[in-house]
């Protein structure tokens, strides 16, 4: 046999840092949040930059704040830190020179934040337990280069893990709606998905990209729909599922982020709508998840005649293209709308609500503003 | 206020068939599955089926399956039950009722019908 | 089927007594068990759904606990009103099924 040289390892280790800023640490302390996104961008791009700036810079993968945590002097950060090094490498010598990188560059970081250089640790961890701290985050996905699709309609299959919130409606062990993992025990659909059918006994919800066999299945405690969505309209078209156990997170099942209230998603972002729902209008759902691509529309140019005409309220957002190429369609209906932030983190944009037909020219598809219904959302579930 | 009237007393014949009617008010009736539920003469309650008024899509305890048929029609908003080849253990009163809400825990039957009596005699 | 076990038919109390009544399911009903009234001219009323939670307009002197396969009514402070047959039933499974009725009497 013979040595492959060019062969490389990869390093996960559980990092922290101390800084100090003058924001409150309530202000970012909950995962999530605006702030604390913001504050770990900041810390991420620190310590990308401190790499950036040594001779590892080919060796840095990524860095991902975790959580931070309150001290008596200022705030602790938890980081995953990911490196790879030629498999040549003494392990020992690499810890050795990851955490100098760390403790000699970072000391040239522009704040704020004022991060202390000193207070580094780094700690190896292996692959299981790197995926068990992303799985605990929400928003995380196993990404895979994601090609422009056409519609769920005609759209593109996905892998495992690559929606890892999406969960599957059943009724008496029938597809009938989408629905998003919010945290292990609650799952967030459209009311319009419980007009008919209401006994939570009946309905269970599987996780994973096939819908037999799934991944994980759980039943449904109770079902809660929001107290002013009056069926046939459309308005308030959110409901809560509470799971009848919690699920444990893994690569394949866990979270999606909430975005804050105060979050404005803007028109002509991209965004991701997944489902099991019919490749054609008044068609059939499909066992395997489906993905496709749909930026948002504003709601001036949603609410035009040839559009829905004064029908999309402030609870609503629309989403697709005018030209009717890509879209969501029945069976699709409760699922996620999602959109990834600049570390990589998606989040929770809209629940798929309702459309005329599926990927008409001039109507897209229309999904619940998740952001004008978060204090809902709070209100129920305390997340 | 819900309200489901059912109808009047039924005496029939063995081998002839039976509809009860029951007059939901008060709501939205397609909004809600309506059960019927049996229960002979100083005996225990037994459900036969329900009907979600809204698709038409019924579901039936496999005992009564071929004896009661459940229908509904939404422009008068009643729900039926037709009983068919009556034999003298299809004497009993028959019960309607609606589900209740879903804006927390689910109630099951939160409202009944004041039931029809049938009897069957040769 | 999920049977329903009422094991007493009927029981006799004096007005004022704290009464309960038991009933079993043949598997775990996962809480999903009610508790229903019929008075003697036969109307049927829900008393408590979801093992515990108390239907609207029902006196608090109702109360119903269990998990799993063991459940219970309780009525506090008997009043005369409450002269009725009860029963359970889980909506957990089809076919819904009751229990056999506990027919309760005053002393």
């Known amino acids: 046999h013979y040595v492959r040289y060019n062969q490389k390892k990869t390093y996960n280790y559980y990092s922290t840092l101390s800084f100090t800023t003058d924001k409150l640490y309530a202000e970012f302390g909950r995962e999530a949040s605006n702030n604390f996104t913001e504050m770990s961008q900041r810390l991420e791009s620190m310590v990308k930059n401190a790499f950036y700036k040594s001779p590892l810079r080919e060796e840095f993968v990524k860095s991902q704040v975790i959580k931070f945590s309150q001290q008596k002097h200022g705030v602790l950060a938890h980081m995953l830190l990911i490196c790879r090094f030629h498999s040549t490498e003494d392990p020992e010598t690499v810890d050795k020179i990851v955490q100098l990188v760390l403790h000699e560059k970072l000391q040239d970081a522009v704040g704020p934040p004022k991060v202390d250089p000193h207070s580094v640790k780094i700690k190896k961890i292996n692959k299981t337990e790197t995926d068990s701290y992303l799985n605990h985050c929400c928003g995380t996905r196993r990404s895979k280069t994601l090609g422009q699709s056409l519609r769920i309609v005609g759209g593109t299959e996905v892998e495992e893990g690559e929606w890892p919130w999406q969960a599957s409606l059943q009724w008496d062990g029938s597809h009938r709606c989408g629905a998003t993992l919010i945290n292990a025990t609650w799952l967030v659909s459209a009311a319009h998905c419980f007009t008919t059918y209401k006994n939570p006994a009946r309905w269970t919800a599987s996780f994973g990209v096939t819908i037999k066999p799934s991944k994980m299945k759980r039943g449904l405690r109770r079902i809660i729909v929001h107290e002013k969505y009056k069926h046939p309209s459309h308005d308030y078209d959110i409901s809560l599922a509470e799971l009848s156990s919690p699920v444990p997170y893994t690569n394949a099942v866990h979270r999606v982020c909430l975005p804050d209230a105060s979050y404005e998603f803007q028109p002509g972002d991209v965004m991701f709508v997944t489902g099991f729902g019919a490749l054609k209008n008044d068609g059939y759902s499909q066992n395997h998840l489906r993905q496709a691509q749909v930026t948002l529309i504003d709601a001036t140019t949603c609410n035009e005649p040839q559009a829905y005409n004064d029908a999309i309220t402030p609870r609503m957002l629309c989403a697709g293209s005018l030209e009717g190429k890509t879209d969501a369609c029945q069976g699709d209906s409760g699922g996620p709308l999602v959109s990834s932030d600049a570390r990589d983190i998606w989040y929770l944009a809209g629940i798929v609500s309702w459309g005329d037909e599926c990927a008409k020219p001039n109507k897209p598809g229309v999904y619940t503003r998740v952001t004008a219904l978060r204090d809902w959302i709070t209100s129920k579930t305390g997340i | 206020q819900v309200q489901l009237q059912q109808s009047g007393a039924e005496l029939e014949r063995p081998g002839a068939s039976v509809k009860l009617s029951c007059k939901a008010s008060?709501?939205?009736?397609?909004?809600?599955?309506i059960s019927w539920v049996k229960q002979r003469i100083g005996q225990g309650l037994e459900w036969i089926g329900e009907i979600y008024p809204r698709n038409n899509d019924t579901y039936y305890n496999e005992k009564f399956k071929g004896k009661a048929t459940l229908t509904a029609d939404k422009s008068s908003s009643t729900a039926y039950m037709q009983l068919s080849s009556l034999t003298s253990e299809d004497s009993a009163v028959y019960f309607c009722a609606r589900e209740g809400d879903y804006y927390g825990d689910y109630e099951g039957f939160a409202y009944w019908g004041q039931g029809t009596l049938v009897a069957v005699s040769a | 089927d999920i049977q329903m076990t009422q094991t007493t038919s009927s029981l006799s109390a004096s007005l004022g007594d704290r009464v309960t009544i038991s009933c079993r399911a043949s598997q775990d009903v996962r809480n999903f068990l009610n508790w229903y009234q019929q008075k003697p001219d036969g109307t049927v009323k829900l008393l408590i759904y979801y093992t515990s939670r108390l239907h609207s307009g029902v006196p608090s002197r109702f109360s119903g606990s269990g998990s799993g396969t063991d459940y219970s009514l309780t009525i506090s402070n008997l009043e005369p009103e409450d002269i009725a047959t009860y029963y359970c039933q889980q909506y957990s499974n089809l076919p819904y099924t009751f229990g056999s009725g506990t027919k309760l009497e005053i002393k």
């Open positions: 008060g709501y939205t009736f397609t909004s809600y599955a």
